[in-house]
Amino acid sequence: LKGQEFAPSHQQVYAPLRADGDKPRAHLTVVRQTPTQHLKNQFPALHWEHELGLAFTKNRMNYTNKFLLIPESGDYFVYSQVTFRGMTSECSEIRQAGRPNKPDSITVVITKVTDSYPEPTQLLMGTKSVCEVGSNWFQPIYLGAMFSLQEGDKLMVNVSDISLVDYTKEDKTFFGAFLL
Amino acid sequence: LKGQEFAPSHQQVYAPLRADGDKPRAHLTVVRQTPTQHLKNQFPALHWEHELGLAFTKNRMNYTNKFLLIPESGDYFVYSQVTFRGMTSECSEIRQAGRPNKPDSITVVITKVTDSYPEPTQLLMGTKSVCEVGSNWFQPIYLGAMFSLQEGDKLMVNVSDISLVDYTKEDKTFFGAFLL
Amino acid sequence: LKGQEFAPSHQQVYAPLRADGDKPRAHLTVVRQTPTQHLKNQFPALHWEHELGLAFTKNRMNYTNKFLLIPESGDYFVYSQVTFRGMTSECSEIRQAGRPNKPDSITVVITKVTDSYPEPTQLLMGTKSVCEVGSNWFQPIYLGAMFSLQEGDKLMVNVSDISLVDYTKEDKTFFGAFLL
């Protein structure tokens, strides 16, 4: 719809209008992750709960095999939060010895796979250095934005280290999208 | 609306359509918090400005007594940011003495209260360890996601420590929701 | 539309309805920033990519000279993420010498400029202290909320230090808005 122009908003528009409740929507929530193979040089993808608790998919938006499947072309708002937690990061120990170092980091990427491009497209990235001294640490990374997606596109959430993801509560780590 | 299926999107849909401007919406902004009693083991709820400055409620979305009241069932996007600020956290002093410790933390929870359900439901949580050494610190936690809400549901924002909330500016700490 | 009341949602509404694809929308992505003069006591504004890669503007939402131009009045969801990166912050060195100090900080502000109003309005602010010891650091600040905007309003993103903005990837630093 990128360049599409409709009648000015003060005019009457009769068709083809949408009932808002008919729009594809999904909110997925975290589950315990099972270790899986992932491609070299590609962060592992999270899998999700899609029907229990707060999670749902509706109006032809389906979840399968770590992917949200986009059922119709349009502009979608896509969001995710991943809460990470870990022990003291390695860099802080090196740091204490007085040697500056590239810090450990945590990263979340919302990725689109499309039939017309041989590589995944990174839609959103949140990346943060972690240099904590002498303690357990935890923190969320939140992402959200609007994208023009095509029918058949697939969305997934990749993380730098699946073992650091807090999977204990559905409100801490989640992933969603809805057609605008 | 979870399992509801409408006519395919290529068909004409005539009713019952909504004028978008008719949808319940609210954006609330921070005010200075008055100390109040809160239940043990439950984070205190923030109260909010609902009509001055950037704040507004419209189309039957009302704010009362720390709660946003959901006037009709549907899928809502709900969001909040809370900016925290404080002095050096306790854990950092312990840490300096060489004793690792569970760090201080800051937490925001967006909570749903349903009359027909005894326990509040935590919709969204942002929680972060805070281990700052020798300085004042400040940082925001942002949350946002889509939820299926019912008419009569109430939403509130709870925080781990109300005294750490930055109430100085309406753009730093806020809470909102809108029907999709 | 603030106080406007429509027919209850269970009634049929025939006009003036909108085709959703007709609504003003934009997603802008980061580009390398050219140093520019900015007013003293005012954070510099970022400029943006508006048509290449993931970036787009549509339905009369235009981007010009660091501003998103609002083409019609209504409620908009406005969002931005800025990823910052830098070397060890100054405060940490002072800190190591045992002198507590107001830490370095990073700040993002989404600002509204209205021709009829002399002062820009800060819609959203994300501000964070940065006190890293002995390392490079990087981290995002995300903001998003709903605002009632008027035709002709202009939106921009201001940052505390343009030299710390990570402009390397379109998924790390972005700015968008869409009419609800």
Partner: antibody, heavy 116, light 106 residues
Framework: QVQLQESGPGLVRPSQTLSLTCTVS????????MHWVRQRPGRGLEWMGR????????KYNPSLKSRVTITRDTSKNQVSLRLSSVTAADTAVYYC?????????WGQGSLVTVSS | DIQMTQSPSSLSASVGDRVTITCRAS?????MYWYQQKPGKAPKLLIY???NLASGVPSRFSGSGSGTDFTFTISSLQPEDIATYYC?????????FGQGTKVEIK
């Protein structure tokens, strides 16, 4: 090892239905998209359609849409092509192609002749 | 349909020569793909997204262009480059290929 292998009858009678199967190995089909492309003798390449195996979404070349069907069986790691009401003009090498999220890969092709 | 017009339809060049093939789309596309097909073999992806070299493809191959006009270049033709080269757009439905350029050695 990643492989795409087309299989099916090499000869189909006019007005009958051409059926081909692509069996994949070495990758998860659900992570990708599977296409069918054909090349008629001495001619260029023609895209026929694709399926998104995880959800089953299909797209077809409008010039073939009334005759072509692409399906998948993820349990067998197979994608199938059916082309109905064939004529001699459908004689071609038919390729199964993987795209999306992973490097493009083509099968070696299957020659199908339409003749009575 | 978006029509892809490829030129020339064939060319003959010497080993070491720079070879250029152009592809024009009937309407603007974001991405262009270039394939190499040797006789009796399946096509092989060389360039995606107009200018990205596919994995394992020699650096003498390159692509450029945007909108409607795209160019594919072999900087120094080698004997093993004898093949037919196709451009393809993946945006409109249907996805369409150019008619091909046959490259031969003089």
């Amino acid at each position: 090892q990643v492989q795409l292998q087309e299989s099916g009858p090499g000869l189909v009678r006019p007005s009958q239905t051409l059926s081909l199967t692509c069996t994949v190995s070495g990758f998860d089909m659900a992570d990708t998209y599977m296409h069918w492309v054909r090349q008629r003798p001495g001619r260029g390449l023609e895209w026929m359609g694709r399926i998104e195996p995880a959800g089953g979404h299909t797209k077809y070349n409008p010039s073939l849409k009334s005759r072509v069907t692409i399906t998948r069986d993820t349990s067998k790691n197979q994608v199938s092509l059916r082309l109905s009401s064939v004529t001699a003009a459908d004689t071609a090498v038919y390729y199964c192609v993987r795209s999306g999220g992973l490097p493009d890969m083509w099968g070696q092709g299957s020659l199908v002749t339409v003749s009575s | 349909d978006i029509q892809m017009t490829q030129s020339p339809s064939s060319l003959s060049a010497s080993v070491g020569d720079r070879v250029t093939i152009t592809c024009r789309a009937s309407s603007s596309v974001s991405y262009m793909y270039w394939y190499q097909q040797k006789p009796g073999k399946a096509p092989k992806l060389l360039i995606y997204g107009a200018s990205n070299l596919a994995s394992g493809v020699p650096s003498r191959f390159s692509g450029s262009g945007s909108g409607t006009d795209f160019t594919f270049t072999i900087s120094s033709l080698q004997p093993e480059d004898i093949a037919t080269y196709y451009c393809q757009q993946w945006e409109g439905n249907p996805r369409t290929f150019g008619q091909g350029t046959k490259v031969e050695i003089k």
